[in-house]
Structures are given as C-alpha cells and as structure tokens.
C-alpha cells in the first residue's frame, strides 16, 4: 500500500503501513515523513540517505530496538525527530551524528535508563527534549548539557527520580539556561537537597503528582529555596493518587523562591482559607487556580499584589468577592456555582475574561460593575441572561467586547453602545438579540469587527444599522433569518473587507446594495436560497472584489434565468468552490454545476 | 461487526462495537460494573493513541429507546495544566489509566441505551476513534 | 416525519381559476420556506411559486407571473396556491414542497394533485 501524499512533494504520511524497511519511491525532496506503527526494528547507517531535505521524522511505534551509528547521518536539516514508543535496547554512540539542525527529540518509553548514557551532547541546536514516561532514576544532568545552550524545554515527568541532590544541577551553575522550562511531575519524589537549586534561575518548573503525602511535598518544597523561576505549577492530576492531607504548611517553603507566576492545577481538596494558604505568594505577578474547589470567596479581597488572576475550571459556593488594587487582568472562566454576578473591586482593571460561566448579570454595563475605568478587553461569552440596563458608562476605555453565545435582554431598547467610541471589536453573535431599533450601534465610530450572526432582524429586514461604522473591515450577518435589505443598508462602511451574509434567507441576488463597498473584498452569500436575481440587469461588484461565495444556493437553471446564469459564468474569477453551484431545478438539471452549463435557449423552451 | 463485552451488573448489561474503520485496538474495564440506579467505580483504560491526546474531546451522541438526545461536547483536555494526566500522551505511547467515577439519584427508565462515543484530538482535529456503547437497562432485575 | 398532503387540483376551462392547498403535519414548518413545482407530461418538474416562512419573501417562475398567487398560514400549517387565468399549459400535477427545518432546500414532497386546463 503506497504512503499517502498530504502535500505534493513534500508531506508523506506511511502510518501503519506494514512497512519493515524505508521506503525508496519517494521523493528527494520529502520534508515531513509520518513512518509510525511500522515494524522497522532497526535502524542501520545512512538509512535516511534519500531523504537530504527531510526536517520532520516520526517514527513513533516501530518497534525499533537497535539504532546504529550515523542512522540519520545524511539529515542535515531535520529539526524534529520523533521515537515515541520504541523499545530501545541498543543506541550507539553516534547514533544522532550528523544532525545538525535538530530542534525537537522526543524519546518517550524508549526503556531510556539514564540521561548520561544518551548520545545527544554534540546536538547543540536543540531547544526541547522530551524523555518522559521512561526509566531514569537520576536527576544528575550530565556534563554534555553545558553543549546544549538553546535548551528551552526538558520533559522528565513519569520517571522514577525520587531524590535531587545539589550536584545534580551543577552543570546550570556552568551555564545558566535562562530559559529553561522543566517538568518533573509524576516522579515519586521523597527528597529534594536544600541547596539543589540554590541561584538556578528557570522559566518555568512544573511539578503535579510527585508527593504521596503532605510531609514530603513540604520538605521538598524546602528544598527548592533559592531558585528563582519565571513560573511555577504545582498540583496534581485528577486519575493519578492524590494527597489525602492538604493545608498551608505544604507551600511555606515558597516563601524562600523567587517565583513570577504561580500555578496551582487540580487539587483534590477543598481550599478554605487561602489567604493563609498562599502567604508567600502574594506578590507574584500572576496567581492562577485551575481546577479546585475553594470555599471561602471573600478572601479574593485580601490585598494580595496579583497583576493577573486566573480561576479556571474551578469551584465555588457563591461568585467570589474581588477587591485587588493592583490587578490588572483576571481571567474567571468555565467555572462552576455562584451563578450570579456580583460587583467587583478592581480599580486596575484592564482585561477581564467572565466567559463560560453560565453566569446571568442583572444589569449590564458599567463601571460600578466592575470597579474600574480602565477597562479595555471584556469577555462574557457562553454565560446566561444578561441584561443590558446601562450603556457601558465609565468604561469608555472598552477596545474589545465579546457576548457571543450569551442571552442578552433589552438590546433594542435604548443605543447600549453609545459610550463605546474606542471599541474595535465587538461580537454579539448568537445572543437572541432581535434588532428592531435603527440607533442600536450608534456611538462605535471606531469599529473595525462586529459579529453579529444567529440573531434576527424585525421583519427579516435588514435596516441602515451601520450608517455611523464607518472604519468597519468586518461584518458577519450570517444565519440572521434575513430575507431583505435596505438598498443603503451598507452605504456608509468604505472600509468593509469581508461581508458574511451567509445562512439566511435570500431569494434572488442583487448587487446595487454594495455599490459603495470600495474596499470590499470577501462576500459570502453561501447557504441562502437564491434563485435568480432580483433585477434583470446586474451591475459589477466593486472592483476591489476578490472572493465571492454563492455556494449551496438554489439556482434555477431555466431559460428565463439565462441572464443572470451568464453573468454567474461572467463573475467566474472571482467565484469559490465552484464545484458546489448546483442548479435545484428543473429536475433534469439538478445537481448540474451552474458554472458547466451551456446556456443557450435551447432550454427548456 | 463484532461486539465487545465490558460488563453486567445487578440492572444493566454493558457492550461496545467499533464506528470507525481502523478499529485500533483499546481495553475498557469497569471495576464495578455500572449499575444505573447509582454507582461509583473505576474505569481502566488501556490504548495507544495514533495521535497526541492534546484538545481531547468527547462528541457523545445518545439514544434512548430509539430517541435521539442532543450531541453533548465533552472536553477532557484543554491543552493546558489539564486535570487528567493522559492529556499529555503523544501519539504511540501507551495510555494505561485508571479514572475514578461517581454518580447517584438518577433514574433510567428500562430499556436499550446507545451511545456513540466519537473522541476528538489533536491540532489540526481529527477522530482519533469511535465507539458505540450499548447499555441494556433492566431496573427491577437482581 | 414531515407529510404534505395536496388538494384542491382539478379539472377547469382555459380562463378559469383554481385555489390548491397543501397541509403539512408531522411537525410545524412555520419557519420554513414552502413551494410549489409542477410536472407536465413529458416535461421535467419544475419550480412554480415559492413562499418563505415569515411571508416576506416570493418567488414566482415567469409563465405564472401576475397570475398565480402564493399565500401561507402558518397558524394552519398550510400554504396555497391561487391560480387564475389559467392556460392549457398550465395543465401539469402540481407538487407541493417544503424546504427542512435546518434549512435543506426542497426537502420534503407532497404526492402531487392533477390540475387541467382544457382549451
């Protein structure tokens, strides 16, 4: 069975094809080449040498137990190289000669032993190793690290290291890899040497599931004193063995770090008291709760100095009680109780993410809600009712605005985005929003994107909503039930780019309403049901017009339609996906495409 | 199309086919078996992935009696710090697991469950399998 | 399941008028756009009239133009078809169609009702 050509001369996948050597029909100029789930079992000398450009190689799965020396010694460009999963018994020497641009090797459950005896000094281009899910027992970096100066990210998790001693890590002491991230978790770590990490500065050490009891995550966390790291995850994950014992001894050791940002992901244990719990995290940059249940929520007002919260997936009784002066963004989302918005404190605020809460606001916008003038990005997408009983006031610094997905109420009742001048982006698709008021955008003079799709119009008619967008590029009105428009509807927009009208309802297809649209580029009028057109004679597009979407449409193919069936075949630069303009009618037409259609009146006369 | 036995217990019987062509090969154990008027347990699971379990997701689509029920998206990795450790699992590495699970107060009307279990991984997406769940519900049996 | 059911065809002199009715059950297709094709004998089946669900919308094949009308009421799940001035080449079975609540065109067929016209 051939491999399969994804891109012409350049991607091959050959997954599990039963293959036990290389190919050879494939070409010189092959750059990813996918050989996984094949028995190959061994790998001689050069047994890439018809490969010269390759730069992606998985060999995930092929039961490759011997790799010899110089086995990808013609791969001079290749930048990833992919093992995953082959029982490796026998790796020579200079089994990775030759490979001199590599950037990413993976070796997970390889049966790989011991990082000394790893071959992989001279690969002085590479940024990630990943070697988890093997059988290293020691933590010692070897001597050969000081090689690997661009290393960005190293992978030991789902070992079996259980002690870090400090002559471990002393090859960083050599040369400090400032960016370097690593993961440890799912080690059984007992013990961590005071002094281990003594003036090592990382970007970012995660470590889940390495304690089995709160002893040992405490003096382990002791022993990371001096480190000074850009981020730091702890935690644990929901399908391994969790601690039955958590409280606020177990992260006084962070106390001695140097810590930026701050993670805590999964934890099996409700959180009480945080305040006293992340004493020594007060004054990181970022503080971040993914996935743990936390029962006391006024204690978000204590005066911690995050810049930046993030409550993800997690779990509370009510909506926390947020007073932080310093915090600048908090990212709240998909988490769970406390259905009811409450106002927050946060003075700094400028980016602020509420979305997938299912939350349901009482009345919505303005500055009271949230405590702050400063906003520029607010998310309130996927939540539940919100009602809009205020026009945004004192928070006329809003760039971006999102309520996708949300059920907003009293949109037609007053111009809710009056103060909004600054606004760039606005999304309020799917929100069952029913426009019956011409002043609904008035005041977003600095719109650039609006979407509005899977909403409804008065009359399914499309009113002059758009007269004060005038540096709008982008607009999708698509799945809205329309069936008419106003023939000014898009008069004012010069700047429109990208024109979704598609999934409603049209009949016929007229150009007269985008006569205006100097600077339109895409119109997609896909998924209506246009049969004809609604004048005999139609006019140009505007030249600027590059792309026109008339696809799964309802042509009808008759005589009487010839004019407006050649100006389609006329219009056929500017056309895609040709092959799905299907004529609906008559019968013997249907499912003709449009485009191949000999259109002299010899039909159906 | 052959069908696998996962288990009975006391008010169900619990099976699954393939719904995808390449049928690669996953172990299910249930250790209780489900029993639908409430249960807890553990699933084990045994598989090795032909793609990264990055962005994992469920589209679980359920019938009842021969009534179809709305697709339900159920998203296991977010493709970040996610809860399950799985989620980190690339293409060709075993997948050997065990994922506790609980439930209670819900009650299922006898009769023919089916569920089709279509997982969703990786960038861009793909259907990394598919599974259909047959669970048969007798309430009142012993 | 949708079913269309059509009445209202006949037999009628040239000149003459005719109202066909289409009832839908199974489920309401008040949102939907519904139609109306027709088959001459020895002619392919061709679209007549065709109405969206709000009523806004018509469409109305050239030969009909100014003589046929096309009219729902969604209250009855019901469209119809207001023929006057009819031809003898109007003579044809008159199907009535229904657009899916998703949106597929032409989705569901009524069985057809015969309408002729004799000169």
């Known amino acids: 069975e051939p491999c399969v050509e994804v891109v012409p001369n350049i991607t091959y996948q050959c997954m599990e094809l039963n293959f036990y050597k290389i190919p050879d029909n494939l070409p010189f100029s092959t750059k990813n080449l996918d050989l996984s789930f094949n028995p190959l079992r061994h790998l001689g000398s050069y047994s890439f040498f018809s490969f010269p450009e390759l730069q992606v190689l998985d060999l995930s799965r092929c039961e490759i137990q011997t790799i010899e020396d110089g086995a990808y010694q013609s791969l001079s460009h290749l930048s990833t190289l992919i093992l995953t999963g082959n029982p490796i018994q026998s790796l020579a020497l200079g089994a990775f000669s030759g490979l001199s641009s590599l950037q990413k090797l993976v070796a997970v459950e390889t049966n790989l032993a011991s990082l000394e005896n790893f071959p992989i000094g001279h690969l002085k281009t590479l940024k990630e190793l990943n070697v988890a899910h093997n059988l290293i027992q020691s933590f010692k970096l070897p001597e050969y690290f000081s090689n690997l100066t661009n290393l960005e990210h190293l992978d030991l998790s789902s070992n079996k290291i259980q002690s870090i001693y400090c002559t471990d890590l002393r090859v960083l002491h050599q040369m400090p890899l400032l960016n370097l991230s690593l993961d440890l978790s799912l080690n059984p770590m007992n013990f961590i040497q005071p002094g281990a990490f003594k003036e090592i500065r990382l970007h970012k050490l995660t470590l889940r599931n390495n304690f089995d009891s709160l002893n040992v995550m405490k003096t382990c966390i002791q022993g990371l004193a001096g480190l000074e790291v850009h981020r730091l995850v702890l935690g644990e994950f929901r399908n391994e063995g969790n601690l039955e014992k958590f409280d606020k001894s177990a992260l006084e050791g962070l106390c001695n770090l140097t810590i930026e940002e701050f993670r805590l992901a999964y934890l099996d244990y409700y959180l009480d008291d945080i305040i006293d719990l992340f004493n020594c995290l007060t004054n990181v940059s970022s503080f971040s709760l993914v996935s743990v249940t936390i029962e006391r929520v006024k204690d978000f007002s204590y005066n911690f100095g995050w810049q930046h919260l993030e409550l993800v997936n997690c779990k509370f009784g009510q909506f926390p009680t947020l007073k932080l002066k310093s915090l600048k963004r908090l990212t709240f989302t998909s988490n769970k109780g406390g259905n009811a918005f409450s106002e927050v404190d946060l003075p700094s605020l400028e980016f602020l993410d509420l979305s997938r809460n299912g939350l349901s606001f009482k009345g919505c916008c303005s500055q009271s809600d949230f405590g702050t003038t400063s906003l520029k990005y607010l998310d309130l997408s996927f939540n539940g009712v919100i009602t809009m009983s205020s026009n945004f006031l004192g928070l006329e610094q809003l760039e971006h605005l999102d309520f996708q997905h949300s059920n907003l109420k009293q949109m037609s009742e007053f111009s809710v985005f009056l103060s909004l001048r600054n606004l760039i982006y606005l999304d309020i698709s799917h929100t069952h929003t029913r426009v019956a008021f011409n002043g609904i955008f008035n005041g977003l003079s600095s719109l650039e994107v609006l979407k509005m799709a899977g909403n409804s119009f008065q009359e399914n008619f499309l009113p002059d909503i758009f007269t004060e967008l005038r540096n709008l590029t982008f607009l999708d009105l698509s799945q809205c039930q329309l069936e008419q428009l106003s023939p000014t509807a898009f008069n004012s927009l010069s700047s429109l780019q990208v024109l979704n009208m598609s999934h409603n309802n049209f009949f016929s297809l007229d150009t007269f309403p985008y006569k205006c649209l100097n600077s339109l580029q895409v119109l997609d009028y896909s998924l209506n049901h246009i049969m004809t057109s609604k004048k005999q004679e139609l006019q140009h597009f505007p030249s600027s017009l590059a792309f026109l979407n008339l696809t799964q449409n309802d042509f009808a193919c008759t005589c009487e339609h010839q004019s407006f069936l050649q100006w389609i075949k006329d219009q056929r630069q500017l056309l895609v996906e040709v092959e799905r303009m299907e004529c609906a009618t008559p019968s013997d037409k249907q499912g003709m495409p449009v485009l191949s259609l000999n259109i002299t009146c010899q039909m159906n006369k | 199309q052959k069908q696998y036995w996962v288990c009975n217990s006391s008010d169900a019987s619990i099976s699954y086919t393939y719904c995808d062509k390449m049928q690669y090969p996953i172990s299910i154990n249930v250790n209780p078996c489900i029993e639908l008027k409430r249960s807890k347990g553990l699933l084990h699971i045994f598989y090795i992935p032909r793609r990264d379990l990055k962005q994992l997701y469920f589209n679980l689509y359920i019938t009842v009696n021969t009534m179809n029920l709305p697709k339900r998206k159920e998203v296991i990795c977010r493709g970040s710090d996610d809860d399950y450790s799985f989620c980190r699992a690339l293409k060709g590495e075993t997948v050997n697991t065990t994922i506790s699970f609980s439930f209670k107060g819900i009650k299922f009307s006898k009769g023919k469950y089916k569920c089709v279990v279509e997982a969703i991984s990786g960038s861009p997406e793909e259907m990394l399998f598919c599974l259909e769940f047959v669970i048969l519900h007798q309430p009142n049996s012993n | 399941e949708v079913q269309l059911v059509e009445s209202g065809g006949g037999l009628v002199q040239a000149g003459g008028s005719l109202r066909l009715s289409c009832v839908a059950s199974?489920?309401?297709?008040?949102?939907?756009?519904m139609g109306w094709f027709r088959q001459a004998p020895g002619k392919e089946r061709d679209i007549v009239a065709r109405?969206?669900?709000?009523?806004?919308?018509?469409y109305y094949a050239e030969s009909v133009r100014g003589r046929f009308t096309i009219s729902r009421d969604n209250a009855k799940n019901t469209v119809y078809l207001q023929m006057n001035s009819l031809r003898p080449e109007d003579t044809a079975v008159y199907y009535c169609?229904?657009?899916?609540?998703?949106?597929?065109?032409?989705?569901?067929w009524g069985q057809g009702t015969q309408v002729t016209v004799s000169s």
């Open positions: 169609v229904a657009d899916s609540p998703g949106g597929r065109s032409y989705e569901f």
């Open positions: 109405i969206s669900g709000s009523s806004i919308s018509t």
């Open positions: 199974g489920r309401s297709l008040s949102t939907v756009n």
